[in-house]
Interface confidence: low
């Protein structure tokens, strides 16, 4: 029976359940390589408290949908009388990378986790040439998460001081040129995730092979090679490589661009000061404050909540956006689909999508970019569930009480994107 | 239609040794791993050993390993099981499988019966 995912194949994921202190290696295709977990292990939990090794799904043992796959074994749990097997289940669902496996919730028997990656999709424009793992968790089983820095298009530049010469990285999977406007980049060859471009030429200088690699607590690697048998003339007969270290700042501090810190032979090494580098507790919420123990800087925008049934407008030209963020309040236009972000069709107000719900809500600030996100909206064509991005900027002079208004700038492949200018949005140190 | 032929089987005596092998018939594929496994009657079928073919890697369960050793020729997609010291719980009928690497298909043996005697 045919597993749906072949890209996700070659690399063994890890996942977490932070409450019990338990980390998941899950290989779809193959095993785990575990020995401990037997050797056709699909899914091996890591009880780290007790530690012990459980096998919760058998690489044998596999049944798929194009949605669902699931792994069951044969060792049995009581459930109400039953005579059940361990299994675990995982749901899959379109994303614009490969993504993260995420633990969901754990029964007696079933240990649920949930999937967004391009290989869910049901069409391919998100796939990539190349792509690896672009997360890794710490001995403490907290996530540092790079995948928000991925490019679907273009490239980032690294900062050196060769005028001759630039060179363009991605992260984590190749640059893709066709997508992007940008001149410069037309000319990089396919499946380069380092492109060096000189004049009116552009050479790979590196392709992802390995995933994210944590090296200290405070430092993540990428390594990527050049696979193509042939040197390049300007390298002395070297193969190119790229070696960029993404290091957590000791503080709060704004974003800073990829730095050139050596280079010999075709042989690049970058540093990358960002706060994508911490681990994700730090950066992220699950509420609308980030004030907790994990994070130094205390924003709230719980005041920006609607009350009674009113929401904010946000007009697209084709659309107009009904935003209710911060609460659980349904927008009435939005026909009980616990929307966030409402999308009505101004020439058809029967054509309403959810751009994103209440349930499925993410703060994050990090590199002084501070973002609400909501996900898990109504599907689009390539199996895409929308979702909204609301980049905020502190404005203490804003209309409305301080409050102000978020204005839609622009929508790319179902994700919609807002600024709100509010005072709420403006960051308080946290007092030591 | 890919399909797996075992071969080697038989009966033996405890101490004794058999040579298992598994080659396809049909049309010829590259594998991501092949394996040996077996069920004898009125159990669950057991992995008994895998051979990774991307990294060479080998798994034994617990209760073969030092006796039994996989080994195979990955452009031929044959898998062999070398049994040595056989003993009367190793009786059982031995399935091979091997999962292709484009499609992640699982294809099974039809099997072939080992029997140890005291």
């Known amino acids: 029976q045919a597993a749906p995912f072949p890209e996700l194949c070659s690399y063994t994921w890890e996942a977490v359940d932070t409450k019990n202190n338990v980390l998941y290696k899950i290989n779809i295709c193959g095993s785990v390589d575990i020995v401990q977990c037997g050797p056709s292990s699909a899914v091996c939990m890591h009880d780290l408290k007790t530690r012990t090794y459980h096998s919760v799904g058998d690489s044998v043992l596999r049944s798929a949908t194009r949605s669902l796959l699931e792994f069951n074994t044969t060792v049995s749990c009581d459930q109400q009388g039953t005579n059940h097997r361990v299994q675990s289940s995982i749901a899959f669902l379109c994303g614009k990378t490969l993504g993260t496996p995420e633990f969901v919730t754990a029964t007696e028997c079933v240990h649920y986790f949930e999937w967004r990656t391009t290989a869910a999709c049901k069409k391919d424009i998100f796939k990539a040439n190349k792509e690896v793992p672009c997360y890794v968790f710490d001995e403490e089983l907290r996530k540092h998460d790079l995948n928000p820095l991925i490019k679907l298009s273009g490239a980032y530049l690294v900062d050196d001081s060769d005028p001759d010469t630039s060179l363009f990285i991605n992260v984590c999977r190749d640059i893709d040129t066709l997508r992007d406007p940008g001149s410069q980049l037309r000319a990089c060859p396919p499946g380069t995730a380092a492109c060096l471009v000189r004049g009116h030429q552009a050479f790979d200088v590196g392709q992802p092979r390995d995933g994210l690699k944590l090296v200290r607590k405070d430092r993540l690697v990428l390594s990527y090679v050049r696979e193509e048998a042939g040197k390049l003339d300007f390298c002395d007969g070297h193969s190119p490589a790229v070696t960029i270290t993404f290091v957590c700042p000791s503080e709060r501090r704004e974003g800073t661009i990829p730095k050139l810190t050596a280079k010999s032979n075709c042989r690049y090494e970058i540093e990358w000061i960002t706060e994508y580098a911490c681990h994700r507790d730090y950066l992220e919420s699950k509420t609308c404050s980030l004030s907790g123990e994990q994070q130094d800087v205390s924003i709230d925008l719980t005041p920006l909540a609607q009350s009674g049934g009113s929401s904010y407008i946000s007009d697209g030209k084709e659309y107009l956006f009904y935003l209710n963020v911060c609460g659980e309040t349904e927008i009435q236009f939005c026909n009980k689909k616990q929307a966030a972000v409402c999308q009505v069709k101004k020439s058809d107000t029967s054509q309403v999508k959810a751009a994103g719900r209440y349930h499925n809500q993410t703060l994050r600030y990090s590199d002084g970019d501070l973002t609400l996100i909501y996900f898990g909206g109504d599907e689009c064509s390539s199996g895409f569930q929308r979702m909204s991005v609301i980049n905020f900027e502190c404005n203490k002079t804003a209309g409305n009480d301080g409050k102000g208004t978020p204005v839609f700038t622009g929508e790319v492949d179902c994700t919609y994107f807002f600024t709100w200018d509010t005072e709420y949005a403006c960051v308080k140190e946290k007092e030591d | 239609q890919v399909q797996l032929q075992e071969s080697g089987g038989g009966l033996v005596q405890a101490g004794g040794s058999l040579r298992l092998t598994c080659a396809p018939s049909?049309?010829?594929?590259?594998?991501?791993?092949m394996a040996w496994f077996r069920q004898a009657p009125g159990k669950e079928r057991e992995i008994v050993a895998r051979?990774?073919?991307?990294?060479?890697?080998?798994f034994y369960t617990e209760s073969v390993k030092g006796r039994f050793t996989i080994s195979g020729d990955n452009a031929k997609n044959t898998v062999y099981l070398q049994m040595t010291n056989l003993k009367p719980e190793d009786t059982a009928v031995y399935y091979c499988?091997?999962?292709?690497?484009?499609?992640?298909?699982?294809?099974w043996g039809q099997g072939t019966q080992v029997t140890v005697s005291s």
């Open positions: 049909g049309r010829t594929y590259s594998t991501y791993w």
């Open positions: 499988l091997a999962r292709t690497v484009v499609s992640l298909d699982d294809y």
């Open positions: 051979i990774n073919w991307s990294d060479g890697s080998t």
